[in-house]
């Protein structure tokens, strides 16, 4: 029977450019986990598997960072990275368990860029 | 890009053959690295997977005779005591062991192997 | 031990025609389970992964389907550019097994 529970930092926004924090955390549990996936849309991004360590999917590398722990950072945020994404934890003897994260992307706001200009 | 850096070609069984796979534009710092061969005309046989800590897995038959190890770029292949047997097409590809596939593969490099 | 067993060996197909190729493992895989394609003279080219997904620029005639032991590669109106090798390859398990891929099969278009 699974007992387990995940918690995610749940619906999250962040500016274009910059960069984000994905945390999920498997608890209630005493299931060991074997490998947690980041995917988005179906395309996965990046693994984190018990015995190998990190894999950084090759079309992300240049944007996603694995860590801290088993969270995900992503990098140079364009409002395309918009969206859901998930983490799935695969633990033995429970099976898969799955976390959602929503992210949105936001323009850098006008009340910012306008205060860096003043009209004569 | 993944490249397949070695000098191939005829070894004998007293040497140690050594396969460089050196992948271009990413570090292998969070890059799981497979090493599959082809003997002539036949069917793909996994060898071994490293993982971006380092950590080894090898299949039943290559455990012992075949080492993986790799730096920041490159992956490399030991055989000690080649056997003719040994004579393939050897490729390195990216990722393996639910990574959702090996990909992009090297090109391969043929080593014979003949006393 | 997983054993990956592939069939047919071979099969022949006329253009626009539709060829299927089975893949069974000897225990459950949880759809860890990628299909490749190789020509004469080139390294595989990763076809789909996870079971049923596409990899990148793979054409949509190529499909894949199955769960548990029992996995399908399905090419709808081949081409000749399909002829070629197929090869089925477990992601499920790397400890204590001889090999993660299927023996392959030939696929030859008419």
């Known amino acids: 029977m699974m007992t387990g529970t995940i918690e995610t930092t749940g619906n999250i926004s962040a500016e274009k450019g910059g960069s984000i924090i994905l945390q999920c955390h498997l608890s209630s549990t005493t299931a060991q986990v074997t490998q947690v996936n980041w995917e988005q849309q179906d395309q996965l991004l990046a693994i984190c598997n018990a015995d190998l360590g990190w894999h950084i999917s090759p079309s992300f590398k240049d944007r996603v960072a694995p860590g801290p722990g088993l969270g995900l950072t992503l990098q140079s945020l364009t409002v395309n990275d918009t969206g859901e994404y998930f983490c799935i934890y695969h633990t033995y003897p429970d099976g898969t368990y799955t976390g959602r994260i929503f992210l949105e992307v936001l323009e850098s706001s006008v009340a910012e860029h306008g205060a860096r200009f003043q009209i004569p | 890009q993944v490249q397949l850096e070695s000098e191939g070609g005829l070894f004998k069984p007293t040497d140690t053959l050594t396969l460089t796979c050196t992948v271009s534009?990413?570090?292998?710092?969070?890059?799981?690295m497979s090493w599959v061969r082809q003997a002539p005309g036949k069917g793909l046989e996994w060898i071994g997977i490293?993982?971006?800590?380092?950590n080894t897995y090898y299949a039943n038959w290559a455990k012992g005779r075949f080492t993986i190890s790799k730096t920041s770029t490159t992956v490399e292949l030991k055989i000690t005591s080649p056997t003719t047997e040994d004579t393939a097409t050897y490729f390195c590809?990216?990722?393996?062991?639910?990574?959702?596939?090996?990909?992009?593969w090297g090109p391969g490099t043929l080593v014979t192997v003949s006393s | 031990d997983i054993v990956m067993t592939q069939t047919p060996a071979s099969v022949e197909v006329a253009v626009g025609g539709t060829v299927t190729i089975k893949c069974q493992a000897s225990?459950?895989?949880?759809?860890?389970l990628n299909w490749y394609q190789q020509k004469p003279g080139q390294p595989p080219k990763l076809l789909i992964y996870d079971a049923l997904k596409l990899a990148s620029g793979v054409p949509s005639r190529f499909s894949g389907s199955g769960s548990g032991t029992e996995y399908t590669l399905t090419i709808s109106g081949v081409e000749s550019a399909d002829a070629a090798t197929y090869y089925c390859?477990?992601?499920?398990?790397?400890?204590?097994?001889?090999?993660?891929f299927g023996g392959g099969t030939e696929v030859v278009v008419k």
């Open positions: 490293i993982g971006s800590n380092g």
């Open positions: 590809a990216r990722g393996g062991y639910r990574t959702s596939g090996m990909d992009p």
């Open positions: 225990q459950s895989i949880s759809s860890y």
């Open positions: 390859q477990q992601e499920h398990s790397v400890g204590n097994v001889d090999n993660v």
């Open positions: 534009g990413s570090s292998l710092s969070s890059s799981y």
